[in-house]
């Protein structure tokens, strides 16, 4: 399945609209730091296919989609940015959506990556807990932000090397 | 508010299959993971597998494995477990638990759908 | 696959009474991922507590969890009559995930 030029060019729009969405300043929420473990390895393109790839992507789409779709996180960012962030994400869910069902459709498909879905639910939770922790504070969120920035490279960064491989 | 409503209860004879449907209302349908999980009477509960209504995929427990198929309709927002090769062992309640983080991890749960196996 | 084994089977106590139930995983279970729920007959199970120590919705202040690890705690501080049920244990941390085979509390 090869995912729409599109698609690439929502992923750049997604994560310049997390970048506009950055409200104070990085330095003053240092003492918030966390290490939330990115699980790298399960995007790093070559421990699996295409397809189960894919599913991984879809896997950390959907999760970032569910986390800025919560009243805590409307509360937290300015409505109209968040909004068109939301937007690419769901266009972007589209896409893989519509590639996962293609693969699905295929015999003899590999079976599904089911550890690294777990490493990507679980990287969520942690995010997740964290938020709870801090009461969903300002720098909390700031610094999830700058996290989910970050995880969103890694799964821009894997899809451009899904695509060499094409 | 989240809503799981779950098919009746079905008797089955030994080596036939039962299919048990979750109809799923209050959220977007196709975000969350639905888990099915079953209690036989008076045991505990078990994790038999989830599926994710957004693309289809499945993730079995390997006990189930080749015997549970898990398929949902998003027309519909329902999800279905179909367990084939019945035996006794597996009268059972079968219930459907809504994915998700934190505070939501199971926190829904659909009424329970009894299929009770016996010649 | 993680065995969660949850004692005692069975916790007879009277309204008013401490109950401590406890919940040991055959290997370690990263405390986040560690859940409990309560069943009372007839009932689908209904989330108490997540990530080990923290309190779902509803829940009230009386029940607290604790532990990490393998041994894993449910409090009830003070057993109000409607307390009185089967409750179990739950890990999300690895395939498959399990259940303990369930703590019955029943009144004394």
């Known amino acids: 399945c090869d995912l729409p030029q599109t698609h690439s060019l929502g992923n750049r729009r997604a994560l310049i609209l997390l970048a506009q969405m950055g409200r104070i300043s990085h330095f003053s929420c240092l003492k918030d730091r966390h290490d939330f473990g990115f699980p790298e390895e399960e995007f790093d393109g070559h421990q699996f296919q295409k397809a189960q790839a894919i599913s991984v992507l879809h896997e950390m789409i959907q999760q970032t989609f569910n986390l800025f779709s919560t009243e805590d996180s409307s509360a937290a960012w300015e409505q109209s940015l968040l909004e068109k962030f939301s937007t690419e994400l769901y266009q972007q869910l589209n896409d893989l959506e519509a590639c996962v069902i293609q693969e699905v459709g295929v015999e003899e498909t590999p079976l599904m990556n089911e550890d690294s879905i777990l490493a990507v639910r679980k990287y969520f939770q942690r995010i997740t807990l964290y938020l709870t922790e801090k009461k969903y504070s300002p720098c909390a969120w700031e610094v999830v932000r700058a996290e989910i920035m970050r995880s969103l490279s890694f799964s821009t960064n894997l899809q451009k090397r899904l695509r060499r491989k094409d | 508010q989240v809503q799981l409503v779950q098919s009746g209860a079905e008797v089955k004879k030994p080596g036939a299959s039962v299919k048990v449907s979750c109809k799923a209302s209050g959220y977007t349908f196709t975000n969350y993971w639905m888990h099915w999980v079953r209690q036989a009477p008076g045991q505990g509960l078990e994790w038999m597998g989830e599926i994710n209504p957004s693309h289809g995929r499945t993730i079995y427990a390997q006990k189930f494995q080749g015997r549970v198929t898990m398929t949902r309709d998003t027309s519909t927002s329902t999800v279905y477990m179909e367990l084939s090769s019945l035996r006794s062992e597996d009268t059972a309640v079968y219930y459907c638990a809504r994915g998700g983080l934190g505070p939501a991890w199971f926190a829904y749960w659909g009424q329970g759908t009894l299929v009770t196996v016996s010649s | 696959e993680i065995v969660l084994t949850q004692s005692p089977a069975t916790l007879s106590l009277s309204p008013g009474e401490r109950a401590t139930l406890s919940c040991s995983a055959g290997?370690?279970?990263?405390?986040?991922?560690l859940y409990w729920y309560q069943q009372k007959p007839g009932q689908a199970p209904r989330l108490l507590i997540y990530?080990?120590?923290n309190l779902a919705s509803g829940i009230p202040a009386r029940f607290s969890g604790s532990g990490s690890g393998t041994d894993f705690t449910l409090t009830i501080s003070s057993l109000e009559p409607e307390d009185f049920a089967v409750y179990y244990c739950h890990q999300w941390s690895s395939y498959p995930f399990t259940f303990g085979q369930g703590t019955k509390l029943e009144i004394k």
């Open positions: 990530s080990t120590s």
């Open positions: 290997s370690s279970v990263d405390s986040s991922y």
